[in-house]
C-alpha cells in the first residue's frame, strides 16, 4: 500500500465539487493516477484525473454536477479511491471515507464592489459563490485591506463572525491606493478551513478637500 | 487515559459478515483519533483502518478492498468495524487502538503512532 510519506487530502465546497491532491515520495511523474467517488446513498459515481502539480504532488477536481447544484448533504459519506495505472490494471494505492460536510473548502468570495467611496472610508461588498442553502447564515469572513509599502501578509485581518457580505473600511488615507481581499469559511466541520482569497480590488479613496483661503 | 475492550469476534464462513465494537472508559474518547489493527498467526501486526477525532475522515488499507466500515460514535464511546464478504485471510486477532497525538485522516497511520491498545478480539473466517 502507501507509506507515511503519502498524503490524501480532499474538500468539498458545499455543492458540487470535490477537490483532491495526492503527494507521495517517490513517486514517478508520469504515472498516470485517478480519484475514484463511489458515494453510500447515491446512484452515481466520478472519477478525475491527477494531473501532477509539482515534484512528488497530483491534483484533481471531481465535477459532481452542475455548480450550483446540491449533490451531497451532511449524512453522506463518499469512498474515495487513489488509483494508480500499473501495467494493464489499475492498483489501488489509498482508499479514504470522506464526509463532505466535514471537509469544507468553499470557493472564493465573488462580485467584489466598491459601494461607496469617500477620503477616509471605503464600503465594499462581495458575494458567495456556490454555497450550499445548509449553511443558512452560519458563515464566516475573513477581510485584509493592502496599504502602500506592505505586502499582504502584514496586512491585518479583520474578522466578520457572521454572514455579513459587505465592510466598511475607516480611517483610511486621503488620495491612496488600496487593495481589498475577503475569503469565507462555514462555522461546521472536522476539517472545514478558509476559502482561497477572493481576486484583489483595488480601489482609491478620494482626495481630501482644498482648505479655504484665510 | 482511556481503556479499550474489543468484542464482537467469532467464527463465521467465507463471504459472510461480523461486526467489531471497540468500547472506551475513563477518559475524554472525542480527543482521540482511532484505529483498527489485525494480527495474523506468525505474522506481523497489520493496519486495517484509523477515523479521526470526529470522523470525518477514515483511512483504510487497501488489502480491505472496500469490504470493511470503520466508524465511531462519540455519544457512546465506542469505535466499530463492520467486516463484510470475509475471506480465510481476513484471520487474525482485531486489535482496537486509541492515538492521543493529532492525526488528520490523510495518511496511513504506523503501529508505533497508536499509545493505546485493547486487548483484542479473535476473528476466524472458515472456507
Known amino acids: 500500500a502507501v507509506n507515511g510519506t503519502s498524503q490524501f487530502t480532499c474538500f468539498y465546497n458545499s455543492r458540487a465539487n470535490i477537490s483532491c491532491v495526492w503527494s507521495q515520495d517517490g513517486a514517478l511523474q508520469d504515472t498516470s493516477c485517478q480519484v475514484h467517488a463511489w458515494p453510500d446513498r447515491r446512484r452515481w459515481n466520478q472519477t478525475c484525473e491527477l494531473l501532477p502539480v509539482s515534484q512528488a504532488s497530483w491534483a484533481c477536481n471531481l465535477i459532481l454536477g452542475a455548480p450550483d447544484s446540491q449533490k451531497l448533504t451532511t449524512v453522506d459519506i463518499v469512498t474515495l479511491r487513489v488509483l494508480c495505472r500499473e501495467g494493464v490494471r489499475w492498483r489501488v494505492m489509498a482508499i479514504q471515507d470522506f464526509k463532505p460536510f466535514e471537509n469544507l473548502r468553499l470557493m472564493a468570495p465573488i462580485s467584489l464592489q466598491v459601494v461607496h467611496v469617500e477620503t477616509h472610508r471605503c464600503n465594499i461588498s462581495w458575494e458567495i459563490s456556490q454555497a450550499s442553502h445548509y449553511f443558512e447564515r452560519h458563515l464566516e469572513f475573513e477581510a485584509r485591506t493592502l496599504s502602500p509599502g506592505h505586502t499582504w501578509e502584514e496586512a491585518p485581518l479583520l474578522t466578520l463572525k457572521q454572514k455579513q457580505e459587505w465592510i466598511c473600511l475607516e480611517t483610511l488615507t486621503p488620495d491612496t491606493q488600496y487593495e481589498f481581499q475577503v475569503r469565507v469559511k462555514p462555522l461546521q466541520g472536522e476539517f472545514t478551513t478558509w476559502s482561497p482569497w477572493s481576486q484583489p480590488l483595488a480601489f482609491r479613496t478620494k482626495p481630501a478637500a482644498l482648505g479655504k483661503d484665510t | 487515559e482511556v481503556q479499550l475492550v474489543e468484542s464482537g469476534g467469532g467464527l463465521v464462513q467465507a463471504g459472510g459478515s461480523l461486526g467489531l465494537s471497540c468500547a472506551a472508559s475513563g477518559g475524554t474518547f472525542s480527543s482521540y483519533a482511532m484505529g483498527w489493527f489485525r494480527q495474523a498467526p506468525g505474522k506481523e501486526r497489520e493496519f486495517v483502518a484509523a477515523?479521526?477525532?470526529?470522523?470525518?475522515?477514515?483511512m483504510y488499507a487497501v488489502s480491505t478492498e472496500g469490504r470493511f466500515t470503520c466508524s465511531r460514535d462519540n455519544a457512546k464511546n465506542t469505535v466499530y468495524l463492520q467486516m463484510n464478504s470475509l475471506k480465510p485471510k481476513d484471520t487474525a486477532i482485531y486489535y482496537c487502538a486509541a492515538m492521543t497525538s493529532y492525526y488528520s485522516g490523510t495518511y496511513y497511520p504506523d503501529s508505533s503512532d497508536f499509545d493505546i491498545w485493547g486487548q483484542g478480539t479473535q476473528v476466524t473466517v472458515s472456507s
Open positions: 477515523t479521526t477525532r470526529g470522523g470525518g475522515r477514515t
